[in-house]
Interface confidence: low
């Protein structure tokens, strides 16, 4: 087993929102489960964007998951990872 | 059974300070964003502050930032609310409450039988 | 700020009648409203989350609609049990605002 590494970015969109993208890369094997969460708890799928699990050429696998969100409230949400019975989360930069 | 139980209201003159404390069973504490909130003597209610579960995250109405610190202790089960330069308008009754978590997303699904806070000199 | 605007602040209805409450978002909210029932002398409980949800033990003659800026709750077959103070509360961002209350009685 090879754990994610996980890392999140932002950038500036529409109307006062920012898009958020959680990126995760390195991992084996491929089954992860990668989302993001508002106030500790999952948004619904029809917010989130899912980038498929490509393999990254060493063996390894990457994906991302992207959300839209009102500039102000970057505190409010983490993404999640699982992977292999280990989970983590990850704050949106400042 | 979830429960929520107030504690630590009175009557306080103004510019005094006040611990609240909510003690919670019946659920896994850590789990969920904890909540206070008051109704004012006109039964209007008025969000007050938010604290995250693991990741400590507060948030606070802009009538008490500054003065008013939530707290949290996982290990005890406890939620608490410090409230300090009271004012006349910080006179209430005051809840606690539980954070909806993945089974009401964005509520507030569980109150306690608050604590009456009652600013006057 | 996001402001909740509440309508009516009071009604009254016969039993039986079918009610609706609507609650007003100044901002898109989304989904992220709920409803709140506080009868006189107890605490608010939990009716509806996320617009359209019954929470548990609720009676289905509750309801809720709405999505973006617009919500109502509705409650059909008034019961003497649902004599109360109705509230809604978005959920959207900070800081969470509540509605100003609409007081239910019966004619």
């Known amino acids: 087993t090879v754990p994610p590494m996980v890392n999140v970015t932002r950038s500036e969109a529409s109307e006062g929102n920012i898009t958020v993208t959680c990126r995760a890369s390195g991992f084996y094997p491929w089954n992860i489960t990668l989302s993001w969460r508002q106030d500790g708890v999952s948004l619904s799928h029809d917010t989130q964007q899912w980038g498929d699990v490509l393999p990254d050429g060493n063996g390894t696998y990457q994906t991302w998951v992207a959300t839209r969100i009102c500039q102000g409230e970057e505190q409010r949400f983490t993404c999640y990872m699982e992977h292999s019975g280990n989970h983590s989360t990850h704050p949106v930069p400042s | 059974e979830v429960q929520l139980v107030e504690s630590g209201g009175g009557l306080v003159k103004p510019g005094g300070s006040l611990k609240l404390s909510c003690a919670a069973s019946g659920f896994t504490f850590s789990d969920y964003y904890m909540y206070w909130v008051r109704q004012t003597p006109e039964k209007r209610l008025e969000w007050v502050a938010t604290i995250s579960d693991g990741i400590t995250y507060t948030y606070y109405s802009d009538s008490v930032r500054g003065r008013f610190t939530i707290s949290r202790d996982n290990a005890e089960n406890t939620l608490y609310l410090q409230m300090s330069s009271l004012k006349s308008e910080d006179t209430a009754m005051y809840y606690c409450?539980?954070?909806?978590?993945?089974?009401?997303?964005?509520?507030?699904?569980?109150w306690g039988q608050g604590t009456s806070v009652t600013v006057s000199s | 700020d996001i402001q909740m605007n509440q309508s009516p602040s009071s009604l009254s209805a016969s039993l039986g009648d079918t009610i609706t409450i609507t609650c007003h978002a100044s901002q898109n909210i989304h989904v992220w409203l709920s409803w709140y029932q506080q009868k006189p002398g107890n605490i608010p409980k939990l009716l509806i989350y996320?617009?359209?949800h019954l929470h548990t033990g609720v009676p289905s003659r509750f309801s809720g609609r709405g999505s973006g800026t617009g919500f109502t709750l509705t409650i059909s077959s008034l019961q003497p049990e649902d004599i109360a103070t109705y509230y809604c509360?978005?959920?959207?961002?900070?800081?969470?605002?509540f509605g100003s209350g609409t007081k239910v009685e019966i004619k």
């Open positions: 409450s539980k954070g909806g978590g993945s089974t009401a997303r964005g509520a507030l699904d569980f």
């Open positions: 996320g617009a359209s």
């Open positions: 509360l978005q959920g959207q961002s900070y800081p969470l605002t």
